[in-house]
């Protein structure tokens, strides 16, 4: 089974990519 | 508590440039976007751009580019707007705002506001 | 660019009675993955800045008064006033954040 393009709902944010606004949001951060 | 204080207010001659700037302090200045919305006199707010100043990616709208730059500095935790090419119709009030960026999108704190005034 | 519209842009109101205000956009506003709809309402009080009050179309914000509540999906928007007080008077805009930023044009409520 291959995770690596799971991302983390609770990790830091330091690989948050800027995206114009929230329709390109795949989930939301807390 | 985040807050978010500007600039003082500029008076300025149409062609020239103007920038504004926005201190950020009480938050991760780089955890959030920084957009910035005028207001010209008796009028609604318009968004002209934002920026992330963790990677200082930018959007802005489309009615302003190339004449708006926005930047950041993440050492001072303060943002700027810079906007060249200044005529009469770009007197009005620019805020800051913190603009919630990941979860609400949306515009929790802002700045107390610059009047930029363009005459001859 | 999606277009934000607002109506009425001015809303005489009588303290203690309801007030609404509609919004529409050009296109919806919900992102089916997140399930969320990115529409926000703002209140710019007379001589002041804006203030968030609701998010996500119908989540308010913290420290706003429950008489505010937002509401609809997709296009259509609705923010609801359920007993206008004194305090409320000011400008109401509505604001999208799906793709970039648009405000609609503003809602002027004053006390009649």
């Known amino acids: 089974l291959d995770l690596s393009n799971v991302q983390s709902k609770c990790g830091s944010k330091d690989n948050i990519k800027h995206v114009p606004g929230g329709g390109s949001v795949q989930i939301v951060y807390k | 508590q985040v807050q978010l204080v500007q600039s003082g207010a500029e008076v300025k001659k149409p062609g020239s440039s103007v920038k504004v700037s926005c201190k950020a302090s009480g938050g991760i200045f780089s955890d959030y976007v920084i957009s910035w919305v005028r207001q010209a006199p008796g009028q609604g707010l318009e968004w002209m751009g934002e920026i992330f100043p963790r990677s200082g990616s930018t959007y802005y709208n489309e009615k302003f580019k190339g004449r708006v730059t926005i930047t950041a500095d993440k050492s001072t935790s303060t943002a700027y707007m810079e906007l060249s090419s200044l005529r009469s119709e770009d007197t009005a009030v620019y805020y800051c705002?913190?603009?919630?960026?990941?979860?609400?999108?949306?515009?929790?704190?802002w700045g107390q506001g610059t009047l930029v005034t363009v005459s001859s | 660019d999606i277009v934000m519209s607002q109506s009425p842009l001015s809303l005489p109101v009588t303290p203690g009675e309801p007030a609404s205000i509609s919004c529409k956009s050009s296109q919806s506003l919900l992102n089916s993955r997140t399930r969320k709809n990115y529409l926000a309402w703002y209140l710019q009080k007379p001589g002041q800045s804006p203030q968030l009050l609701i998010y996500w179309a119908s989540t308010r914000e913290s420290g706003v008064p429950d008489r505010f509540t937002g509401s609809g999906s997709g296009t259509d928007f609705t923010l609801k006033i359920s007993r206008v007080e004194a305090e409320d008077v000011g400008v109401y805009y509505c604001k999208q954040s799906f793709y970039l930023r648009t405000f609609g044009q503003g809602t002027k409520v004053e006390i009649k």
């Open positions: 705002a913190r603009d919630y960026y990941g979860t609400s999108f949306a515009m929790d704190y």
